[in-house]
Amino acid sequence: IWELKKDVYVVELDWYPDAPGEMVVLTCDTPEEDGITWTLDQSGEVLGSGKTLTIQVKEFGDAGQYTCHKGGEALSHSLLLLHKKEDGIWSTDVLKDQKEPKNKTFLRCEAKNYSGRFTCWWLTTISTDLTFSVKSSRGSSNPQGVTCGAVTLSAERVRGDNKEYEYSVECQEDSACPAAEERLPIEVMVDAIHKLKYENYTSSFFIRDIIKPDPPKNLQLKPLKNSRQVEVSWEYPDTWSTPHSYFSLTFCIQVQGKSKREKKDRIFTDKTSATVICRKNASFSVQAQDRYYSSSWSEWASVPCS
Amino acid sequence: RNLSVATPGPEMFPCLHHSQNLLKAASNTLQKARQILEFYPCTSEEIDHEDITKDKTSTVEACLPLELIKNESCLNSRETSFITNGSCLASRKTSFMMALCLRSIYEDLKMYQVEFKTMNAKLLRDPKRQIFLDQNILGVIDELMQALNFNSETVPQKSSLEEPDFYKTKIKLCILLHAFRIRAVTIDRVMSYLNAS
């Protein structure tokens, strides 16, 4: 058992049939010595008396808010949560495995630039009695500060018969240099509590590996005289790190015809303009990636060819 | 082909081309090493990220773009011990900081060159002959060093008489290649920035 925060305790249980569970001793936070009784949650049933209460925690029915009373007045509370370990592996029932970029990916994080600001998100099908808290640092043995904001419900989606909820959090490294060469990874720890179940999820990454630029902006087409070619131009996204000559992007450009079967012509360029040929009903798209470190490509920015 | 992009003319800044080759070689060599050593801890998540140039050079700080010099988080350890001139420099316009920066890059390359050569000598004694560095990566390091054209005493290759631990040597190679790739990214950014300036 360990303290998650004041008056909230996590009991770690090996979860298998007929498991012995954990013996837990609760102590009433009071100078009183006599006439103390204990109850669990809203039930008025007295579980024991005395300054301490010893219980065997085996299942969720044994978890909850234990309260010690004297003369009808509550003296202190202890909330017990369960953290299940099955076959030596901590449970991951609350969050959905996003399977990207690999299996057992529960937290996904992205950064739009090298400023030390990043966003992490996770998915769940649970809609009620759910709370999250997030901590982050650079490195674990001698951690350097990262400040995270409040967790927000960022999206709701219908997936077949289920509703899926996306939660996200924004974090900022306290003293980040965009040009720095990262040697220690950022660690992100998410505590998830659903009713009386506690789970924790972690992710470890370098900012350079989670970079995903915003799409190029101000995409423009200029037709060339007596030709079905157009001069296309675009600009670096506003959110990308500066100076652009140091934090350079490379671009992938494509012309996509009206039918998905039609072959896509793709080329790569470091410039912010190109000459393309527009087919009927085609659209022109461009995406960006860090020129020197192959992290994610941005989403496509698109414009109709004509 | 339905798309066309004009190819750029020759770069004004002669080191840019060499730094691009350096990054390509660093990335390709690392990728190849990860494939060959797939059963060794050789991924970014598995290795310790060491920096053999730590406390010896200050490339990131010395080569900071002017726009980031105001950022206090970037100025933890300003090193100002190097000053000299080289053929990549645009002669009179060369600033003190630019000379310092290029000198620091040169020193990085020299250190990695020694480490890679020492490691290669060990790996060539491995009876499995599982992995060793091809001449490409050593060649591009050499080309960029020549383009930087700093006079520097040659560092002797470290020799070792005892039989190497090949497992440890291969892990060390992974660590070295990861670190070198990160430094090659910084070098390429710097050269691109200087070329644009």
């Epitope: 007596n226 030709s227 079905r228 070619q229 040929i277 087919r279 009927k280 004509s306 | 082909r1 339905n2």
Partner: antibody, heavy 119, light 110 residues
């Protein structure tokens, strides 16, 4: 920039025939080429086209009856099994624009070659 | 697609104005992929107007084109004897296979 059709002659029904359009002064890799025909005393009929990248398109009535192909300086129109209704002057015409859409303006035109199908 | 040209034939006097209409059974691509041609006996057609209203180079300014979508017009103002010919419209569509010429309008100058 010139175009010239050749291969027009008298053929019996069912005898395959290939007409050739030879171009000069421009590149077929940047221009779309069209075949158009005109029966005696009648109007113009678009048969089909081959685009700069080698893609082909045919009028609905012409599909399966005609095949268009090209080399670096020639464009061929193959008539698989001519009938008397295919008697006409056959023109090749270039797309007016570089990388023209199919259906874009046609300019210049060749002088035409006459095909007579008769038994 | 079917392109219907009216009227045919049309008679014109020198110095007068001739208007030829071209109606498409479906909207041409981007509302303007329509061109006009002039053909004289024994000659190949000659491009006059492209993109519905743009005059091809070397074509006298007395020729003009207008219209959009499915209705288009070729106008010859100040008709000259040399304008006696057959005029065709050509439409391009979303589906390349629908590309087609109109039936032609013969202009007789008296």
């Amino acid at each position: 920039q010139s175009l010239e059709e050749s291969g027009g002659r008298l053929v019996t029904p069912g005898t395959p025939l290939t007409l050739t359009c030879t171009v000069s002064g421009f590149s077929l890799s940047t221009y779309t080429m069209n075949w158009v025909r005109q029966s005696p005393g009648k109007g113009l009929e678009w048969i089909g086209a081959i685009s700069y990248d080698g893609g082909t398109a045919y009028a609905n009535w012409a599909k399966g009856r005609f095949t268009i192909s090209k080399t670096s300086t020639t464009v061929d129109l193959q008539i698989a099994s001519p009938t008397t209704e295919d008697t006409a002057t056959y023109f090749c015409a270039r797309g007016f624009y570089v990388y023209a859409y199919i259906g874009d303006a046609f300019d210049p035109w060749g002088p035409g070659t006459l095909v007579t199908v008769s038994s | 697609a079917v392109l219907t040209q009216t009227p045919s034939p049309v008679s014109a006097t020198v110095g007068g104005t001739v208007t030829i209409k071209c109606q498409s059974s479906q909207t041409v691509y981007k509302n303007n992929l329509l061109s006009w041609y002039q053909q004289k006996p024994g000659q190949p057609p000659k491009l006059l107007i492209y993109l519905a209203s743009t005059l091809a180079s070397g074509v006298p300014s007395r020729f003009s084109g207008s219209g959009s979508g499915t209705q288009f017009t070729l106008t010859i103002s100040g008709v000259q004897c040399d304008d006696a010919a057959t005029y065709y419209c050509l439409g391009g569509y979303d589906d390349d296979a629908d590309t087609a010429f109109g039936g032609g309008t013969e202009v007789v100058v008296v």
